[in-house]
Each structure stands twice: as C-alpha cells, then as structure tokens.
C-alpha cells in the first residue's frame, strides 16, 4: 500500500460498497501523487477501532460513545476530523445535552430525586447516558441493575425502550414504553412533549429540541435549563448551562503515526469534489443503499480537529465523567458534603517541590500534580487530572476559553480587608538600562527583548498587542533582533537570548532561567536591551532584596521605564509611565470544583499566608525566594471575586478585547483546541 493511502474501515456490506465507490471517484479527481483510499471491512465499530490501533486500518467515523471507547487503552485513538452540520458560515460540530424544566417548578439539579423524568429513550446519549451518568453517584444503592436504581430515584419516568414488565416505574408516564414514534413521548420531541403535557417535571433532550418544538419565543420563555452548578438559565443560554457538550460524528486515527494530516488532506479534497451539492455521480453525505454510511447523511462538511485536542478534551469533562460512571460504576464510599483534596497543578520541578511541601503541611487538604507547561496544566484541570492553579491574566483568558472559571484573585497590597477587596490590577512596564539613554518606545526595532513568557500579560500580551497595532503583523521575531520569550518556537530569534540548557532552553517554566518576571529582568541585566515585566519587578530584585549572585549588587537607579509617549521616567514613576494596567493573577478551576477550591484555599491562606511572620521556621504559601512558585511572591492574600466570577468579568472588557485582537498572532495550541469546542 503506498504511503499516501488512507485505509478506511467499513462495518457492513453497504458501507464497503460505498467505500469502494469513494475510492474510485477519488482516483478520478486526485492526481496520482495525492492521497488515495483503500477499504478494509470489519464486522463492527469495535473491530474497526482495534484494526486502526493495530495499524491494519487508518480511519473510521464514530459517534461520541465510540470515540470514548477508541480513546481507552490499549486503543489510544484520537479525533482528527469532525463532521459539521448547519452551514459553512456557522458550522455545528457539537450538540448540547440539556435538562429542561418548566419555569415555575422551583427545583435544581441536586433536587431531582423524587421528581418525574422524561427521557428520549433507554441507552440514548442526551436522553439517558449523559443525565444518568452524571446522576449516577446520587442513585440509591444497589446501582445495578441501573434501570432499577433509576426507577427508585425518580418518582416516575418515561424511558422509551425500557422493559415495562421488569421496571414499570420507567414506563409510568408513557404506558408501554414503546420504542418508536408510535409512543407519543419517544425521541427528542416526545420527551419534550412529556414535559410540556405536564406528565414529567424534567426532560433530558438536546439544546435544539426546544427550538424545534416551540417556534415562539414567548412559549420558550415558559421553560428553563437546569445547570450543573444548581442554578437555572434561560433556554437560549445552553452554551453556559448544559449537562454535556457532545461531538456529533468524528473521524478517529492512531495517536502516534496516525496519518492525521493525510486523512485531513483526503477528506478536505473529498468534500471539495463530492460534498453537499457538488457532484451528481458520487455524494459523500448520501447513502442510497442505507443510512449514514461512512458519514452521516445530514453532515454538511468536515473540519480539522486541532492537533492539541485529545479525546478527553474533545469529549469534555462532563461527558467523560458521565460515560465513565456508567461503564465503571464506581463512586466514592458515601457521598459526603466534605471536600476532596484539591489537586494543585505545579510547573516543573521547582514548583512541584514547593507544592509537595505545601501538601505535607496541609495535612491532606492539598495534593500535587505536575506538568511541564502552563497550557498542559490547564488541560489537566479541564480533564479532571488536576483541580486548580494560579495564573497570569493571559492564561486566565485561555483557561476561560477552555471553560475554567476564576475563583480567587491574588492581592499585592496590604490592606485591612485584603480578602474582601480584589484589586484593580498591576502595571505592565518596559524597563531599560539607564545607560542606554537613546532607547525609547519608538525605536525598539532591532533591539534585544526579554519577556516573561509568550501569552503572559505584562511580558507578552500587552507589549506585543501595542506593537501589533503599530506594525500590523505578527512577525515579532523579525521586529526584535533577538530575545528571550519562553514558549516561542525553539528556532525563533526570540529564543536566542534564553539561558536554559539543552531541552530546557526557552521552555515556559522555571527550568529556563530567564522565565517569569525575575527571569526577564535577569535577561535584561545580563544580555538584553528591554524587559517587559510588572511594576514591582525592579524594586523586588535590586537593593539586595534578591540574594542571587546576578542580582545582589543591582541598584534600582540604574534602570528606567519607557513611556508610550516616547519619554522615559524613573522606575518609581510607574503610575505615570506604563504600557497598561494588568489584571492580577487569579486561581482558576473547573466549575464543579469552584466551591471546594474556594473553601480550602481560604483555610490554607489562614494557616500559611501573610500572617505567618517567620518563613524560615514555617511553611509560607506566598514565598519562594523571588521565584514566584505557585503564587507570586508579593501576594498578600487571595481575595474573593464577588461578582467577577467569569473570565470576561474578571479580566475586564478592555483586556479581553486586547488579547482577542492578538489572537491572530497566537501560537497557543490549547486556545485553538478550546475555541474549536466553543468558537
């Protein structure tokens, strides 16, 4: 088989026939050096998954539940291409599983026990697997058989396709539990009708169901959605209030050596020639000899899944939790109101050591998880491997786009009521050596730059955003002659000044000596012309305050700030000479962990925060010898956010807009992946 062949897996005679037609038609339109199709027939989707894992086939299209199976070891497959529905302008690759209730019914998600439930059908995704999977640990024991546990949880149900003889309560609201449209409460529309008629209290359907059944907004306003955080939202706010976000139909391939680029090249060309309304001879999204052969008949095209996206991220935390609960059937001993330990994400070895010290001192309240980069940490929090970390505003933006929420803010000023008063922010500045007297904001081109890291606020988003507005392109590595911006591509001139050894060179963690505020300032001291840092960085590392050999003899008076009007000012005049105000660093977590992270961190700061006077004899959460490990070293306390509890509200409109403008320059693979899930 030539290297540019994609071996497609078919699961029936009809699929194999369509696959051969696909192969032949592609041959006729694609040059001989382009991608080609070969067909492999297997008896089932699970056999196809195994064949791909064993390198006997390369690709198959799967529903969400099978994407989960494909991801599990030993298969280790990943999503590479998604089918989309709707229009090219507004492509839909996901649907949302929701819980719909009547507006006046007054109960929340955690009060469903004893209510009457309407399901699309037993074993179906939005109508059964997702809601029951998420409620699994609240079901009465024994939880097997599942139908019996569900019947005992709700006071009555309509779950079409259930066994009405063995589980009569599941058919109480729709006598007979018929498994077709002959049952008026079958399917999406049927489950909604069950709610609408007053038979049930809650309907588990998908987000579009209510719009398809109620054209009139006034009618829709009589209904609400139950959210997982035990609040309710209007039905059109399904993106912020759903049980799970579910991919519709996805092509999977091997994680390693999986030909993902070739598969995309093939399918992209296929949709150009044989997509919706393209050809009479062969249609990719049509199945004359069956239904949904190879691809869904309702699909409109394909979108490439970003390479950073693994199956866990693609399926989403809620979906994976629901399916895992159903499959594995394991729950904590007895669900208590007590919080589980918070798993803190630590970057590289230095942070991990401090985190472990915290963990020991926390007496079981904190556990530690390691990752090499901030983005890897965010991904771990998303998928439940970790729970929380404190982030610079630039990463709060990425985390927010990935569905995480800010929960507490670092405060840097001593005040009587620190924990109740989140601050307005700190100043992003450009520092230069006083001796380089000709250097201004207007003649930085060709100079050597020092940045905290790519994607961070003071070190990147603010200065590069301002620069972008001036130069109108993203080639910052051409603007500066060289620099150190940890997180840049290793061959970039913005890694040339970095000091990390070997693989650690230019890494966005403490293994790179020029990483972070202190690192960027050190870069200026030793090699650079300008450093983009926070207003406190120079005083914190001069006058003997940093005992490290490179810093111990530095004097604040030897440095100046660049002002945007082309002038320069002394370091202490940052309030009148800065690039922008930056939002303080903040702790982020998943929505489901928000309350526990808040509670445990407030306890922890009372034990180990700024009230600890002797850090040589006691563990201090906000100290790490100017290395800003886990939290900034100048943190005085972690403050409540009050109503600034979403990333947009926390960062503020101006900053969100600035980072949004810089998105076209973004190299963040995680941001790309998260905006695929939520454009």
């Amino acid at each position: 088989v030539p290297d540019k062949t994609v071996r497609w897996c078919a699961v029936s005679e009809h699929e194999a026939t369509k696959c051969q037609s696909f192969r032949d038609h592609m041959k006729s339109v694609i040059p001989s050096d382009g991608p080609s199709v070969a067909c492999v027939k297997k008896a089932s989707y699970l056999d196809c998954i195994r064949a791909i894992a064993a390198n006997e086939a390369d690709a198959v299209t799967l529903d969400a539940g099978l994407v989960y199976d494909a991801y599990l070891a030993p298969n280790n497959l990943k999503p590479v291409v998604a089918e989309f529905y709707g229009s090219k302008e507004d492509p839909q690759t996901f649907y949302y599983a929701v819980a719909v209730v009547k507006k006046d019914s007054g109960f929340q998600m955690n009060q469903l026990r004893g209510k009457k439930s309407c399901h699309t059908g037993l074993g179906r995704s939005a109508g059964w697997n997702i809601p029951i999977g998420l409620l699994y640990c609240d079901l009465p024991e024994p939880r097997k058989p599942l139908e019996k546990a569900v019947a005992n949880f709700f006071s009555g149900s309509c779950a079409p396709c259930a066994d009405g003889t063995d589980f009569p309560q599941l058919c109480q609201l729709c006598p007979g539990c018929g498994c077709s449209t002959l049952n008026q409460y079958f399917g999406y529309s049927g489950a909604f009708k069950c709610l609408k008629d007053g038979a049930g209290d809650v309907a588990f359907v998908k987000h579009s169901t209510i719009f398809e059944n109620l054209a009139n907004k006034a009618d829709r306003d009589q209904y609400e959605l139950l959210c997982l955080d035990n609040t309710r939202k209007p039905v059109d706010e399904y993106k912020d209030c759903h049980l799970a976000q579910v991919p519709s139909h996805t092509v999977v391939a091997r994680s390693m050596g999986g030909k993902e680029d070739l598969i995309w090249e093939l399918l992209n060309q296929a949709q150009e020639h044989f997509g919706k309304d393209k050809s009479k001879e062969f249609q990719l999204f049509s199945s004359p000899h069956g239904k949904d052969l190879l691809f869904k008949d309702s699909a409109h095209g394909f979108l490439k899944v970003p390479p950073r996206m693994d199956a866990k991220m693609y399926l989403g935390y809620e979906y994976v939790t629901a399916i895992r609960n159903l499959r594995e059937g394991t729950c904590p001993e007895a669900p208590t109101d007590e919080c589980k330990p918070v798993k803190w994400c630590a970057l590289s070895h230095h942070e991990r050591l401090k985190c472990d010290e915290w963990s020991v001192n926390s007496v079981g309240k904190i556990e530690c998880v390691s990752a090499e980069t901030t983005e890897d940490c965010i991904a771990k929090i998303m998928n439940g491997e970790a729970d929380a970390m404190s982030l610079d505003g630039g990463f709060v933006y990425i985390a927010g786009k990935c569905g995480l929420v800010p929960v507490l803010a670092e405060n840097y000023n001593k005040s009587d009521n620190c924990e109740d008063t989140p601050e307005a922010g700190y100043f992003a500045i450009a520092v230069v050596k006083k001796s380089a007297s000709d250097l201004t904001w207007d003649n930085l081109k060709g100079k050597k730059s020092c940045h905290t890291a790519v994607g961070r606020t003071a070190g990147w988003n603010i200065p590069m955003g301002l620069l972008y507005n001036k130069i109108n392109h993203c080639r910052f590595d051409e603007f500066f002659s060289e620099g150190c911006a940890p997180g840049s591509k290793k061959d970039s001139s913005l890694c040339k000044l970095c000091m990390g050894s070997g693989l650690n060179l230019c890494e966005p963690n403490n293994k790179e000596g020029y990483y972070g505020y202190t690192g960027a300032f050190r870069c200026l001291v030793e090699k650079g012309d300008v450093a983009f840092v926070k207003h406190q960085t120079v005083p914190q590392n001069t006058g003997g305050k940093n005992p490290d050999p490179w810093a111990k003899n530095l004097n604040e008076k030897d440095y100046e700030l660049l002002c945007l009007d082309g002038t320069r000012k002394p370091v202490e005049e940052y309030a009148n000479c800065h690039l922008a105000r930056a939002p303080n660093h903040a702790v982020v977590t998943r929505k489901d962990k928000e309350a526990c992270v808040h509670k445990i961190l407030r306890q922890q700061q009372h034990l180990f925060g700024s009230n600890v006077t002797d850090c040589s004899g006691n563990f201090c959460l906000f100290r790490s010898e100017t290395k800003d490990l886990l939290f900034r070293d100048d943190t005085v306390c972690l403050a409540k956010l009050h109503d600034r509890n979403t990333y947009e509200k926390y960062l503020g409109e101006e900053y969100v807009k600035a980072v949004g403008n810089l998105r076209k320059c973004s190299t963040s693979s995680l941001l790309e992946a998260c905006t695929f899930r939520r454009p």
């Epitope: 472990d356 963990s359 020991v360 001192n361 007496v363 079981g364």
Partner: nanobody
C-alpha cells in the same frame, strides 16, 4: 507531645557519605509526611527532601541522585542517606512534620 530528634551528622570529606536519622517520640509521627531541611550559615533554611505517608519522595534539584530519604514507621524513624557529599551540603539538618516544632538539628560539615 511528639518531639523530633535528629542524629547522624558529623565532619566528612567531599565525596563521603553520612546517614542522618530523625526519630520521633510519641505516636502518629509522619502520618502526613516528613521533610528534611538544612540551613547553611547566613542563609535561608531550604528544603532538602521529603517523604509522604504513601512513600512518595521528592528532592531539591542539587541533591537528586545523591540523597535518598526513607522511612520505617515501626521505628518512628525517617532516614536521609547522603552520598557524594559536596562542600555546599554543609549546614544544620532538621527534620519536620506538621504540628511539631523544629528540633535542635544535626550539624553536617563537608570539607574540601
């Protein structure tokens, strides 16, 4: 109440070895983990190694591969085996567990 006693320090040449012990009086010792710290003259106290109740260990970068922390719960003891000692390892070594004050420590001096 629990008290910690550190022993095993001494004067040793560079490249030599020492084995420090941390013995606790009282019960429940180290249930949340034990940390070895050291303090060199005129410097901040710094974490050297730690061991948690499940046996998980971690070390500061400069001692990794040379030092090994271990525990014997039956003897209420945590050990720090120090090999390939360097002059920079000189200092007073203390062990610590949550809720228990620092002990006197044990002096380690590495001569070049």
């Amino acid at each position: 109440e629990v008290q910690l006693v550190e022993c095993g320090g001494g004067l040793v040449q560079a490249g030599g070895s020492l084995r420090l012990s941390c013995v606790a009086s009282g019960s429940g010792f180290g249930i949340n983990g034990v940390i070895w710290y050291r303090q060199a003259p005129g410097k901040q106290r710094e974490l050297v190694a730690l061991i948690k109740s499940d046996g998980y260990t971690n070390y500061r970068e400069s001692v990794k591969g040379r030092f090994t922390i271990s525990r014997d719960d039956a003897k209420n003891t945590v050990w720090l085996q120090m090999n390939a000692l360097e002059p920079e390892d000189t200092g007073v070594y203390y062990c610590k567990t949550p809720g228990v004050p620092f002990g006197q420590g044990t002096q380690v001096t590495v001569s070049s």
